[in-house]
Interface confidence: medium
């Protein structure tokens, strides 16, 4: 069974998938469609790297631009370095500016909804 066929079989169960499962899927050439990606738990999507999302979505990564204002894409963008987002070649904006340090302060983030940044 190839990645696409496997994805079809598990698609209906993915809504509650944890980050670890999504990372594993990104290595299996599944080409997750955007409709499914948009239904994933935001907290599961946030830790994914730009490279992992690109692998997870396959051709559908090109559709991220259309969803950049919607959750979970919007929140995921806020967590990525702008340099990394730029490598997607989609013009996504809103990432962490170059030279900033990201502090993973869970309480701060829980209160504000955004990561805490220290300037250069």
């Amino acid at each position: 069974m190839n990645g696409s066929e496997y994805f079809v079989k598990i698609q209906s169960f993915l809504g509650g998938a944890p980050t670890e499962d999504l990372k594993a899927l990104s290595q299996q050439n599944v080409s997750m469609d955007l409709a499914t990606f948009m239904k994933l738990r935001t907290d599961a999507v946030l830790p994914l790297t730009v490279a992992e999302v690109q692998k997870l979505l396959g051709p559908h990564v090109e559709g991220l631009k259309a969803e950049e204002r919607h959750r979970p894409v919007r929140d995921w963008i806020l967590r990525q370095r702008q340099d990394d987002l730029d490598t997607l070649g989609l013009g996504l904006q809103g990432g962490i500016p170059n030279g900033y340090l990201v502090l993973d302060l869970s309480m701060q983030e829980a209160l504000s909804g955004t990561p805490c940044l220290l300037g250069p």
């Epitope: 990645g3 696409s4 066929e5 079809v8 050439n29 080409s31 469609d33 409709a35 396959g58 051709p59 559908h60 090109e62 559709g63 631009k65 259309a66 730029d86 490598t87 997607l88 070649g89 989609l90 013009g91």
Partner: antibody, heavy 120, light 107 residues
Amino acid sequence: EVQLVQSGAEVKKPGASVKVSCKASGYTFTSYWMHWVRQAPGQRLEWMGNVNPSNGGSNYNEKFKNRVTITVDKSASTAYMELSSLRSEDTAVYYCAPHYIGSRPGFAYWGQGTLVTVSS
Amino acid sequence: DIVMTQSPDSLAVSLGERATINCKASQNVGTNIAWYQQKPGQSPKALIYSASYRYSGVPDRFSGSGSGTDFTLTISSLQAEDVAVYYCQQYNSYPLTFGGGTKVEIK
């Protein structure tokens, strides 16, 4: 208005290489991946590969992987498709087409096509 | 690779009548399908995306339906300018693939 202007027709001998250009205007070149599709006489359309204009990363159809190279010149908003080791069955019209422009998937805009004739 | 099989290969329909073109994918592609119209000597023109949504400027006599593996393009009332070859395309996974085309003519 989105415009894709391709280079002119080419006649090549078997074993030679051809490089076709596609100059884009009317949109942000680095925000949309450029794809190349070819059509041999009386045949179906055939996807060759694409390129991420931001960093030059590419995906290729396995059928062409060892013979095709897709590149970009960001400063000139131009994409290139080079096909090597030409054979008679490579005689076709070659098209460039960005995907997902205006947030809709599919190839909504196409270049005018470049006829490449391979003949001894 | 996902193989897209179109039927029929050609279709002759009277002006004002309905034309129906089928496209079958070799595996589930969801609704990640587009349809194109190509006239002789011209680049393809996009008609439908996501299986059933018309691109702006496409007449509403063109409609698409289906999901999974079976898709249909319908021209509800054939006009002279609709004479062309029609292609389906999947963008669900790499490599992107096209159907073999259906030639629509006037009876």
